[in-house]
């Protein structure tokens, strides 16, 4: 499995003469899995023009991708610890199977691709370990996870295209409002 | 290239309500992990962080001026306001608005109006 | 609250001579602390963010170091142009708070 950044991987900030928290362990982790989506999306923007597509909402509609909305708890508004935590796990077991897809659907990216999904798979387990209350946390089911990629990978290429653009595109939203929010735990 | 303009009155009277205007371009409130934030300085002294505005309309303000302070946005406008209610001459002061955030959603301002000043006197 | 306290508060300083002006934190920030410069009558300029990293289109003589409470920005060979007032940010919790402010005046 992949290591933390800060550890013994490539570190997104400085090197650091202390040990990190917890916290700032997974904020770092965090960034990690953000520069990977971003070299994702360079590729996906230089191969097609769907970073600049007007027909977003079109694709969108037959995607159910996680989102935050000020009742998950997580806005400063209304924040509770809790509630934001099984959000942000909820959130990010949904978005596994939309990594899934991802693999396979690059060429220059392929390793980068799976160190996302691993690296998210690894930021999963230490949320898991952070969460008081994990009853709450709803793990997708496996069956239906198997025909939505049946379902995706159906598709046509410019759908694949767009689909594969509207995931990085919301899984990177979904990590940043992630950060912020772990950021006050 | 990333500019800010403060707008707003550069004088007001004491109880008045401050309205202050941020306009920007360069960068877009749409864009995830980007935000819009407010700082203000009182002559020959240092900065002092007031409230901040997320992509997604999440607020964050200064404790100590909470009650006092509301941020919005208008994302078409390219413009963040400012308001604070009963002002006194203590916040006679420079404010700033800043660009913040990025990719890791930053706790830093990378790029600053040219400041507005604002005195609080009758 | 994280209180950020700075020394010195007043430097005065010969052109191509080393300027350290130093930050500590309350308590500890990891890496999350941000410098930014300010000249007389202009606004804050970013100068290094996450206590080292450099920051596009700011010159080379700018670096900073640290990490936990302790933090050092160094100007090497300070320019006529570096006088300012130097800032150090906590960007790890909040509220963002500021330091007390270095002015670096050139002799």
């Known amino acids: 499995a992949p290591v933390l950044p800060g550890e013994d991987s490539k570190n997104v900030a400085a090197p650091h003469s202390q040990p990190l928290t917890s916290s700032e362990r997974i904020d770092k982790h965090i960034r990690y899995i953000l520069d990977g989506i971003s070299a994702l999306r360079k590729e996906t923007c230089n191969r097609s023009n769907m970073c600049e597509s007007s027909k977003e909402a079109l694709a969108e509609n037959n995607l159910n991708l996680p989102k935050m909305a000020e009742k998950d708890g997580c806005f400063q508004s209304g924040f509770n610890e809790d509630t934001c935590l099984v959000k942000i796990i909820t959130g990010l077991l949904e978005f596994e199977v939309y990594l899934e897809y991802l693999q396979n659907r690059f060429e220059s990216s392929e390793e980068q691709a799976r160190a996302v999904q691993m690296s998210t798979k690894v930021l999963i387990q230490f949320l898991q370990k952070k969460a008081k209350n994990l009853d709450a946390i709803t793990t997708p089911e496996p069956t239906t996870n198997a025909s939505l990629l049946t379902k995706l990978q159906a598709q046509n290429q410019w759908l694949q295209d767009m689909t594969t653009h509207l995931i990085l595109r919301s899984f990177k939203e979904f990590l940043q409002s992630n950060l912020r929010a772990l950021r006050q735990m | 290239q990333v500019t800010l303009k403060e707008s707003g009155p550069a004088l007001v009277k004491p109880t008045q309500t401050l309205t202050l205007t941020c306009t920007f371009s360069?960068?877009?409130?749409?864009?995830?992990?980007?935000?819009v934030g407010w700082i203000r300085q009182p002559p020959g002294k240092a900065l002092e962080w007031l409230a901040h505005?997320?992509?997604?309309?999440?607020?964050r303000y200064n404790s100590a001026l909470k009650s006092r302070l509301t941020i919005s946005k208008d994302t078409s406008k390219n413009q963040v306001v400012l308001t604070m209610t009963n002002m006194d001459p203590v916040d006679t002061a420079t404010y700033y608005c800043?660009?913040?955030?990025?990719?890791?959603?930053?706790?830093?301002?990378?790029?600053w109006g040219q400041g507005t000043l604002v005195t609080v006197s009758s | 609250e994280i209180v950020l306290t700075q020394s010195p508060d007043f430097q005065s300083v010969t052109p191509k001579e080393k300027v350290t002006i130093t930050c500590r934190a309350s308590?500890?920030?990891?890496?999350?602390l941000h410098w930014y410069q300010q000249k007389p009558d202009q606004s804050p300029k970013l100068l290094i963010k996450?206590?080292?990293q450099s920051i596009s289109g700011v010159p080379s003589r700018f670096s900073g170091s640290g990490s936990g409470t302790d933090f050092t920005l160094t100007i090497n060979s300070l320019e006529a142009e570096d006088a300012a007032t130097y800032y150090c940010?906590?960007?790890?919790?909040?509220?963002?708070?500021f330091g007390q402010g270095t002015k670096v005046e050139i002799k």
């Open positions: 800043a660009r913040i955030g990025g990719l890791y959603v930053d706790y830093l301002m990378d790029y």
């Open positions: 996450y206590a080292s």
């Open positions: 505005i997320w992509w997604d309309d999440d607020k």
């Open positions: 360069g960068f877009s409130l749409s864009t995830s992990g980007m935000g």
């Open positions: 940010q906590n960007g790890h919790s909040f509220p963002w708070t």
């Open positions: 308590q500890s920030i990891s890496d999350y």
